[in-house]
């Protein structure tokens, strides 16, 4: 007796596809161990076609796939497009070498079958409209046309030109003639379902010179296209359910029992199990649409489908795509955080996972909005102007080779409690799904700044110093300023760094920059934060207005996010004459060109703002004495 | 309403044959697998064989104890289930009972894993 398990007999037709699934015993060495499928020859030899350490046959070559699903203690072998060759014994099994535990699964693959001569077979899918087409002799052309269903040895009309029609037929069965055509008619029937599968026998006339035609109608529901995706990765399910229902609501639902339960539709309902991680997308004139669905879990395997009506609602008689999605928990995708928590006034520093073989592909951040089918605006990325209403206080830190980029949010207001995506113009199943939380603030914020009211004189020597407690101790102090392609790390001086580590003065610990003397171009926003490495903490911002000399009035600063630094001893710190330079960048036209979901932040030109000299941002690390 | 009615249980002599039918109505969908289970008196159901179908495959799964005596057959748009015993032995004597489920969704051993059961017809192999 084996321990691996399987369907012993598997029968199809030829240009079918299988999916033949094995079960093995619950063991690390199992799941662990090499998978394969052979077949069995008359030798006894048992020839690989296809193994889990990525060994693929000729004769298998582009229509074979094996998958270990580990947690499951299982593995899938897919085969498409079946011939008759195909016929004959195989083993599924666990080992180095197929003598290994193993299966015997016999594999049958017939002819698709034959009908008599004077039988048509029309073959639809549920939902569609066959069209049957019934010819006779001219002797019958002022006769009675009529179809009927074949129930055992009677006939049941379905539909006849005395304008008669099968109450079940109602609105679905037309029979008609086609221009000056006098030996033929046709009967269509839309909407088809699987009862109305069966034999139909049309008839001009009465009696034996009646003119009879047999047609055998075949009501397929569509077979489930297998998805093997693993787990926190995405998944798109592409519709095309044709040009007659282009104007028809779409939906997904996901099958359960009996029912099937609409996931998304374009009607505005959505599923909250999916709320933030999914979306809807139109993709032409013709019906065709896609959805979307980020951050997979265990729980999202199961059957899917796709279909058209007028509620938005799964109904009987209209077409169907399906699909059977299933999740694979050995995930090359890293756990990361899916809820992220900040508080009013604070930030939050969140790090997205990336493909690290694709370092050098462009890095994105996007809002999850849940109006009409879903979208996610594009508000930072490594080529991407920041979004309006986010300047100053997004930046994204791109870490290249770490496998990782750190988005960060400061001056939250409660406003941005919502999800976010992150993602990259490479590999598109490394997106993932972030919550973000922001709860009133109860206490001040860690980092504070002074002066309050920032305004700087050209010419001058200005310093802003920034407050940070003893936690922080530790953890590396910086300054940067801030410009659409990010916040540029600037040299500063940290104070509290010179005291012994075992006395620790909250009052005393400062990080300060000076900007010496002060340019026009100095103006603009300044992050104070923390970091440890390539994890950044905590950021606080302040607007830095610049002045001439000559002018008396104040500068108004352009948001109260300054007003949060609360009075504090200013201090010496190291002088930097810092500048930054203009040149232009254009976001990358091609990004989702075939993912429309996810919103360009513009395809205009932007200004990112870079280094140009040594005491700048470009490259260089903060320096902290 | 999804209905399992099982037939053609009895008494039969060690050695002899007999066939099984299941017919199912309701059950939804056109993918779906349909199973024999046996519960022996105070025992547990056991799993016997099964049959799934998507779209125009099948696949049969057979218990180890019944392999190369017993045959799992059926027809997915009429809804039953065949199983033709044969040699059967008084080991075989339980409540045969018919399974069903709208999908081939994991492993067709487990009785967990099928949504819909029949009542149950008795079979009785003695001399």
């Known amino acids: 007796q084996s321990p691996i398990f399987g369907p012993q007999d598997v029968s199809s037709i030829e240009g079918n596809s299988v999916s033949i699934t094995c079960y093995y015993p619950d063991t690390s060495v199992n799941r662990h161990t090499r998978k394969y499928w052979c077949r069995q020859g008359a030798n006894g030899y048992c020839a690989t076609l296809i193994s889990s350490n990525g060994y693929l046959s000729k004769e298998y070559s582009g229509r074979a796939s094996l998958i270990n699903f580990p947690e499951n203690s299982t593995f899938v072998i897919n085969i498409a497009h079946l011939t008759q060759e195909d016929t004959g014994s195989y083993k599924c099994g666990l080992g180095t070498t197929n003598r290994g535990l193993f299966f015997d699964v016999s594999l049958e693959v017939s002819q698709v079958p034959e009908f008599p001569n004077d039988t048509h077979v029309y073959t639809k899918d549920i939902g569609r409209t066959v069209t049957i087409e019934c010819r006779f002799k001219e002797g019958n052309a002022h006769s009675k046309k009529s179809l009927c269903k074949k129930r055992g040895e009677a006939c049941e009309v379905v539909i006849d030109s005395t304008e008669y029609v099968d109450p079940s037929y109602k609105d679905r069965a037309i029979l008609f003639m086609k221009g000056t055509s006098r030996d033929i008619f046709y009967v269509n029937i839309s909407h088809l379902i699987p009862s109305d599968a069966g034999l139909y026998v049309c008839q001009a006339g009465e009696g034996p010179s009646a003119d009879k035609n047999n047609a055998d109608l075949q009501v397929l529901e569509p077979e489930p296209e297998l998805l093997y995706k693993d787990l926190r990765s995405s998944v798109t399910f592409e519709c095309d359910l044709g040009r007659e229902v282009a104007n028809d609501a779409k939906y997904l639902c996901r099958k359960n029992k009996e029912t099937c339960d609409v996931i998304i539709n374009t009607l505005g309902k959505r599923d909250p199990a999916f709320e933030g991680r999914i979306l809807l997308t139109p993709r032409d004139d013709n019906g065709r649409f896609s959805v979307l669905i980020t951050g997979l879990r265990k729980e999202d395997a199961g059957h899917y489908q796709c279909g058209a009506h007028s509620s938005g609602l799964p109904q009987e008689g209209w077409p169907v795509q399906a699909w059977q999605l299933f999740v694979n928990e050995e995930s090359t995708i890293p756990n990361s955080r899916s809820v992220v928590k900040g508080v009013t006034g604070g930030s939050v520093a969140i790090v997205c996972p990336y493909n690290p073989k694709e370092s050098s592909s462009l890095k994105y951040w996007c809002h999850w909005e849940a109006d009409e089918n879903g979208r996610c605006p594009v508000l930072v990325g490594t080529q991407a102007l920041v979004q309006e209403g986010y300047e100053g206080r997004l930046a994204l830190f791109d870490q290249p080779g770490s496998g990782a980029y750190t988005v960060i949010l400061n001056q939250l207001t409660t406003q941005d409690s919502g999800f976010y995506w992150c993602l990259t113009d490479g590999d598109s199943r490394w997106r993932t799904t972030i919550e973000l939380q922001v709860a009133e603030a109860t206490k001040k914020p860690d980092l504070e700044v002074t002066p309050q009211n920032a305004t700087a004189v050209i010419g001058e020597t200005f310093t802003i110093s920034c407050h940070y407690p003893c936690k922080f101790y530790s953890q590396e102090k910086y300054w940067c300023k801030w410009s659409n392609d990010g916040c540029h790390i600037l040299p500063s001086h940290d104070e509290g760094a010179r005291q012994s580590s075992v006395s620790c003065d909250q009052s005393s610990q400062i990080v300060s920059m000076t900007l010496n003397p002060v340019k026009k171009e100095d103006e603009g926003w300044y992050w104070c934060g923390v970091k440890e490495g390539q994890v950044y903490g905590e950021t606080t911002a302040i607007y830095v207005a610049v002045e001439e000399r000559t002018r008396g009035s104040p500068h108004i600063n352009p948001t109260d996010a300054n007003a949060r630094a609360k009075d504090a001893p200013e201090e010496e710190a190291m002088e930097s004459s810092v500048r930054e330079d203009e040149n232009k960048a254009n976001l990358d036209p091609r990004l989702f060109a075939d993912e429309r979901e996810i919103q360009n932040a513009g395809d205009q030109a932007q200004e990112n703002r870079a280094s140009g000299n040594a005491g700048s941002a470009g490259g260089q690390s903060g320096s902290s004495k | 309403e999804v209905q399992l009615v099982e037939s053609g249980g009895g008494l039969v002599q060690p050695g002899g044959s007999l066939r099984l039918s299941c017919v199912a109505s309701?059950?939804?969908?056109?993918?779906?697998?349909m199973a024999w289970f046996a519960q022996a008196p105070g025992k547990e159901r056991e799993f016997v064989a099964a049959?799934?179908?998507?779209?125009?495959?099948?696949?049969?799964y057979y218990s180890d104890s019944v392999k190369g005596r017993f045959t799992v057959s059926g027809d997915n748009a009429k809804r039953t289930l065949d199983l033709q015993m044969k040699d059967l032995n008084p080991e075989d004597t339980a409540l045969y009972f018919c399974a069903a489920h709208p999908n081939d969704d994991g492993d067709p051993r487990i009785s967990g894993n099928y949504q819909y059961w029949g009542q149950g017809t008795q079979v009785t192999v003695s001399s």
């Open positions: 309701g059950l939804p969908g056109s993918s779906s697998r």
């Open positions: 049959i799934a179908w998507r779209g125009r495959t099948s696949y049969k």
